[in-house]
C-alpha cells in the first residue's frame, strides 16, 4: 500500500463509529486528534493507528497514517495526533535528491580520500581528500520529525534551515 496521502485517502467520515468520541468545536476548530463533522457541530476523533491530525483544524477528515516502506524501520507508531515516524534501515540513508527512497551507503571512500563521517539514516559516509580536507559526500540536513517525503525536497527554504 502506498504511504503517500492522495485525494482518495481523504474520504470524510460521515458517521462516528461507537469508539469515535465527539466533542464540540472551539471557535470553529477541532483539537488535534479530531476532525470536524459535515455540519460543523461536532469534533470526531480520529481512529487510532489508522488516521491522525496533529493540529487544530476544521478538516472534514483525518489524514491516513503512513505505512513505513520496506527498507524502513518504524521509530514510533501512528497515534491519533502524530503520524508514523519512519527511518531508513541500518546501512541505508535517505538522500535529499531522492527523499522518497532509502539508498545503500557506500562501503568505503574513493582512492586518495579518508572517511570522516559514518553512514547514518540521513546521510551517506562522508569522505575528505587526504591532503586538502575537501568534502566529498551526499550529505543532507538533519532528520526532521518525519523522515518521509513525496518526490523532491525544496532547494530554497530547506537549505536555509539549520
Amino acid at each position: 500500500e502506498s504511504a503517500l496521502i492522495t485525494q482518495q485517502d481523504l474520504a470524510p467520515q460521515q458517521r462516528a463509529a461507537p469508539q469515535q468520541k465527539r466533542s464540540s468545536p472551539s471557535e470553529g476548530l477541532c483539537p488535534p486528534g479530531h476532525h470536524i463533522s459535515e455540519d460543523g457541530r461536532d469534533c470526531i476523533s480520529c481512529k487510532y493507528g489508522q488516521d491522525y491530525s496533529t493540529h487544530w483544524n476544521d478538516l472534514l477528515f483525518c489524514l491516513r497514517c503512513t505505512r513505513c516502506d520496506s527498507g524502513e524501520v518504524e521509530l514510533s507508531p501512528c497515534t491519533t495526533t502524530r503520524n508514523t515516524v519512519c527511518q531508513c534501515e541500518e546501512g541505508t540513508f535517505r538522500e535529499e535528491d531522492s527523499p522518497e527512497m532509502c539508498r545503500k551507503c557506500r562501503t568505503g571512500c574513493p582512492r586518495g580520500m579518508v572517511k570522516v563521517g559514518d553512514c547514518t539514516p540521513w546521510s551517506d559516509i562522508e569522505c575528505v581528500h587526504k591532503e586538502s580536507g575537501t568534502k566529498h559526500s551526499g550529505e543532507v540536513p538533519a532528520v526532521e520529525e518525519t523522515v518521509t517525503s513525496s518526490p523532491g525536497t525544496p532547494a530554497s527554504p530547506c537549505s536555509l534551515s539549520g
Epitope: T6, Q7, E145, T146
Partner: nanobody, 124 residues
C-alpha cells in the same frame, strides 16, 4: 510541476493584518495538498497551515490558531493566508508549498513545489 509565487508581505504594526497570496501556474491545483510554512531569522522552517485545494477546511499551528485563515480562489488559481492580530514573533519569510501527494502534511519534506517566499515584518 506547479510553480508558486507568493506576494503580500511587508511591514506591519503589532495587532495589524496582512493577506498573503500564493499564485499557482503550470497546472490546475485540483487535488493538491497546500501548506504555508515560515522561517524566522536564524530558525528552521515552521509549519503554519495546511489544506487541500478543492476540499473545505484547514489545519493550523497552535501559534497561529484563531488568528490566521487559509482560503482559495479557484478562478485565480491562488491560495491566501489571512493574518490578523499580528505579533512580533510572526516576523518571518512565509513560503507556500504544494504537492499532489504527501506523507506527513506538516513536514516540509513532503512538498515538492515551493515559492520563493515573502517577508513579513511585524514591528512598531
Amino acid at each position: 510541476e506547479v510553480q508558486l509565487l507568493e506576494s503580500g508581505g511587508g511591514l506591519v504594526q503589532p495587532g495589524g493584518s496582512l493577506r498573503l497570496s500564493c499564485a499557482a501556474s503550470g497546472r490546475a491545483l485540483t487535488g493538491y495538498h497546500m501548506s504555508w510554512f515560515r522561517q524566522a531569522p536564524g530558525k528552521g522552517l515552521e509549519f503554519v497551515s495546511y489544506g487541500i485545494w478543492d476540499r473545505a477546511g484547514a489545519a493550523y499551528a497552535d501559534s497561529v490558531k484563531g488568528r490566521f485563515t487559509i482560503s482559495r480562489d479557484n478562478s485565480k488559481n491562488t491560495l491566501y493566508l489571512q493574518m490578523n492580530s499580528l505579533r512580533a514573533e510572526d516576523t518571518a519569510v512565509y513560503y507556500c508549498a504544494a504537492s499532489m501527494a504527501v506523507r506527513t502534511y506538516y513536514s516540509p519534506r513532503s512538498y515538492d513545489s515551493w515559492g520563493q517566499g515573502t517577508l513579513v515584518t511585524v514591528s512598531s
